[in-house]
Interface confidence: low
């Protein structure tokens, strides 16, 4: 069909909850394109009727709510004037028994559902809610072990739960809850979050610290080879992982077939009070689809990104 497969995204979801996925792949979707969603290689597009339980809402696919039988691979086809790209989203629906500890919790938790608080510090948890504009989210409530969180140490601020003077007792199973309203109907959104506590104070007051990159763009010519280092300082006894990700996927997995973009071997230099780590990302050949996409360096709870952009035209050459 002439469409280029970009990548596969895996999502593990709880049944009976609203879920939305936005088909976005800059710079492709930043231009004049049409986006169409399909399920399991069906030739019939997902409905655009807003009353449908599953429907396309602009570039989003929206499930109101997710059902047991909705598991499967969904394709989003992005058509431009001269191009066609396809994103595959593999959805696995499972049944989460929220308040029954005898039954297993969330399988294969993604980073959004595993968060860390720092002992003795003022810290926060984030409730990740991604929905189109047509969905109105009510105020967020926070629960720990199925009891609503109350107390002077806790403050709800938009999508965050601020925790002052974090203690060891703050580890455990949290959930954030919001009521989503769409076309006059209400649905409950629940995100489970497994919270662990770390004691490390860290070098320079943060654990760990990304020295480079600094959330910036890099001008690079199409077709060139590019190597970017991620430089991180961390405590000598740290157990943090350092890696490069794109679209929340390890670059080595994301580009598993082409191996066009790879993560390098980590090296480190030892100082008296800390280590300086370096892990690079190599673009064997910069392609059009790389521009505008955040390539994220992750180091424990810290992140920083680079975005590739085309150099401005040099009119002096004409």
């Amino acid at each position: 069909d002439g469409c280029k497969d970009i990548f596969m995204k895996n999502e593990i979801l709880s049944a009976s909850q609203p879920f939305a996925f936005n088909c976005t792949f800059p710079p492709i979707t930043s231009g004049e394109v049409s986006v169409t969603w399909y399920k399991n290689s069906s030739k019939i597009p997902v409905s655009k009727i807003i009353q449908s339980r599953i429907h396309q809402d602009e570039t989003w696919i929206l499930f109101l709510p997710m059902e047991w039988g909705d598991s499967g691979v969904y394709q989003c086809v992005i058509k431009g004037r001269d191009s066609c790209h396809r994103i595959h989203v593999n959805l696995t629906v499972f049944e989460k028994h929220w308040c029954d500890t005898s039954i297993g919790g969330l399988p294969n938790l993604s980073d959004e559902y595993k968060q860390i608080l720092h002992l003795g510090k003022d810290d926060s948890l984030t409730c990740h809610l991604h929905f189109p504009k047509s969905c109105v989210l009510g105020p967020i409530k926070w629960y720990k072990d199925c009891n609503e969180i109350k107390g002077e140490r806790f403050t709800v601020l938009e999508t965050r739960l601020l925790v002052s003077n974090v203690s060891a007792e703050d580890r455990g199973n949290y959930a954030c809850q919001a009521i989503l309203t769409h076309s006059g109907k209400q649905y409950e959104v629940l995100n489970g979050i497994t919270v662990s506590i770390t004691e490390r104070a860290g070098y320079g007051g943060s654990v760990p610290k990304i020295i480079y990159p600094k959330n910036h763009s890099i001008e690079v010519q199409l077709g060139t080879t590019l190597i970017v280092d991620c430089n991180v300082t961390d405590t000598k006894d740290n157990t943090n992982l350092r890696c490069w990700r794109v679209n929340n996927t390890l670059v080595d997995d994301y580009y598993d077939e082409s191996k066009r973009i790879r993560e390098g071997v980590e090296t480190h230099v030892s100082f008296r009070e800390h280590n300086l780590y370096t892990v690079n990302i190599t673009f064997l050949e910069v392609k059009m689809e790389d521009y505008g996409l955040p390539f994220m360096c992750h180091a424990g709870v810290s992140t920083a990104y680079i975005i590739l952009q085309l150099p401005a035209p040099d009119f002096r050459a004409y």
Epitope: S16, Q17, E67, W98, C99, D100, E148, A175, E188
Partner: nanobody, 128 residues
Framework: DVQLVESGGGSVQPGGSLRLSCAAS????????LGWYRQAPGKQREAVAT????????YYSDSVKGRFTISQDNARTTVYLSLTSLKPEDTATYYC?????????????????????SGQGTQVTVSS
């Protein structure tokens, strides 16, 4: 749209039994709480019983424990409340509620009422 339709209420003598049904349509309940609350004239609403997680978790208020049983059908479209050993103080309008937060305190014995939908109610009268 969401509809909860209760049935099965009526008048019964003390010690008698009733079975209330709540037919739910237009909503998915897979992980949400379904339950019953009651309200007698001039009294506060009381959470009576809830069921969640596909029947894996149930809650009963102390006043009905051992006498009332909550259950649901396999399709999870109907929730039942079996009332036995009824007492005059059980007299009230019984409401079915759904779309509750399974994390909300209502679902496991608290006093807040975080349901999204409730029915019109069915009257239960216990008197000799």
């Amino acid at each position: 749209d969401v509809q909860l339709v209760e049935s099965g209420g009526g008048s019964v003598q003390p010690g008698g039994s009733l079975r209330l049904s709540c037919a739910a349509s237009g909503y998915s309940y897979r992980t949400q709480c379904l339950g019953w609350y009651r309200q007698a004239p001039g009294k506060q609403r009381e959470a009576v019983a809830t069921i969640s997680g596909g029947g894996t978790s149930t809650y009963y208020s102390d006043s009905v424990k051992g006498r009332f049983t909550i259950s649901q059908d396999n399709a999870r479209t109907t929730v039942y409340l079996s009332l036995t050993s009824l007492k005059p103080e059980d007299t009230a309008t019984y409401y079915c509620a759904a779309g509750l937060s399974v994390l909300g305190s209502w679902c496991h014995g608290g006093s807040s009422y975080e349901y999204t939908y409730s029915g019109q109610g069915t009257q239960v009268t216990v008197s000799s």
